[in-house]
Interface confidence: low
């Protein structure tokens, strides 16, 4: 008879996720010379620990803290891109300009970028089936708390001037209950960063409106000003133009605005 | 998608040299790395070396810093793994693999079929 198990609202954990979290971590710290010290089934069995065998309601930062000690990474704290709703753009952007750094550009955030896990109270098993969903379920999954640590840590290692790019194709162009929105802009330090500096990045073809103005960049402008953190924005009006001459900025179509 | 084509394995003695060669098509290529891979029989196949495709950064194994150098030409879309000084244990399916232009590939997205180095004592 099949142990009855707990049905979440959210998609199960990742086919092959054990396999995956590997084999990204060796791929990684195989290109990343400065990582190569890192033990991979160690990293495997600090990211296992944080959530198996735990009720996927009850994960706590703290849970993690073994991971986050094996992933210690230095970036440049000058050179962070943060994002919110245009991750594949960011991370195109990052591809190209190698010396900046978005959080999946990190060790710990490749690895669990675009997967989902949990396990189950009292079992060793990884539940495939289901996964708490964030706002059905719980906010304390294995998920939402692995993202939010080292979503917090990314900010608080920030530092002079910090990028964001957010997609101005959005209703809400700055959202307060984005991870951007709840978790990085809280902990950036302003003691160590000068300045936010957003990118808007539009997506119509003839979209010429200045989304700067905006209330909800506004409103991003008001929380990182009374954090006595300097804020400024731009629009990227063509972001197919802006890839392009990031790549070839000698090019002549690019001392125009993008 | 993209299509793969290893050349340039064969039977070489030990301290011999062999230079494989990888040629990418396919439309939608625009990949960030590309890399050699190595699988020894009954063994996990293992990596070899890496450049990347726009600044030209390498990496390699351990095992065969020094003798082996890994180079592209972007205008033929072609990858080469320069293997000089070459050891018994370096006998192998040499594969050749690309990576998508999103960070957030598991593994390279894209593999050849693989070309056999022997290399004799």
């Known amino acids: 008879v099949p142990r009855w198990r707990q049905q979440w609202s959210g998609p199960g954990t990742t086919k092959r996720f054990p396999e995956t979290v590997l084999a990204r971590c060796v791929k990684y710290t195989e290109i990343h010379p400065e990582m190569r010290h890192v033990d991979c089934q160690s990293v495997w069995d600090a990211f296992k620990g944080a959530f198996i065998s735990k009720h996927p309601c009850n994960i706590t930062e703290e849970d993690y803290q073994p991971l986050m000690k094996l992933g210690t990474q230095t970036v440049p704290c000058n050179k962070i891109l943060l994002w919110s709703r245009i991750k594949d753009l960011a991370h195109q952007f990052t591809q190209v300009q190698r010396d900046m750094f978005t959080l999946e550009d990190t060790l710990l955030g490749y690895l669990a970028d675009d997967l989902t896990w949990c396990g189950e109270f009292n079992t060793s098993k990884i539940n495939y089936q289901s996964c708490p969903d964030w706002r059905k379920d719980c906010s304390n999954n294995p998920v939402s708390v692995f993202w939010k640590t080292v979503s917090r840590r990314f900010a608080e290692a920030a530092c002079d001037v910090v990028h964001v790019m957010l997609n101005g194709s959005r209703s809400k162009i700055f959202d307060k209950n984005s991870t951007f929105g709840s978790v990085e802009v809280h902990n950036l330090q302003p003691e160590k960063v000068q300045t936010l500096e957003a990118w808007v990045i539009h997506g119509g073809r003839e979209d010429s409106r200045d989304l700067c103005q905006d209330p909800t960049i506004k409103e991003l402008e008001s929380i990182i000003s009374k954090r006595n953190i300097q804020f400024s924005c731009k629009n990227i009006y063509r972001p197919d133009k802006f890839l392009q001459c990031v790549k070839n900025p000698e090019d002549s179509s690019c001392t125009s605005e993008i | 998608q993209v299509q793969l084509q290893e050349s340039g394995g064969g039977l070489v003695q030990a301290g011999g040299s062999l230079r494989l060669s990888c040629a990418a098509s396919?439309?939608?290529?625009?990949?960030?790395?590309m890399g050699w891979f190595r699988q020894a029989p009954g063994k996990e196949r293992e990596f070899v070396a890496t450049i990347n495709w726009s600044g030209g950064r390498t990496t390699y194994a351990d095992s065969v810093k020094g003798r082996f150098t890994i180079s592209r030409d972007s205008a033929k879309n072609t990858v080469y793994l320069q293997m000089n000084s070459l050891k018994p244990e370096d006998t192998a399916v040499y594969y050749c693999?690309?990576?998508?232009?999103?960070?957030?590939?598991?593994?390279?997205?894209?593999w050849g079929q693989g070309t056999q180095v022997t290399v004799s004592s």
């Open positions: 396919g439309r939608t290529f625009s990949s960030v790395a």
């Open positions: 693999a690309a990576d998508r232009f999103s960070v957030v590939a598991v593994e390279y997205d894209y």
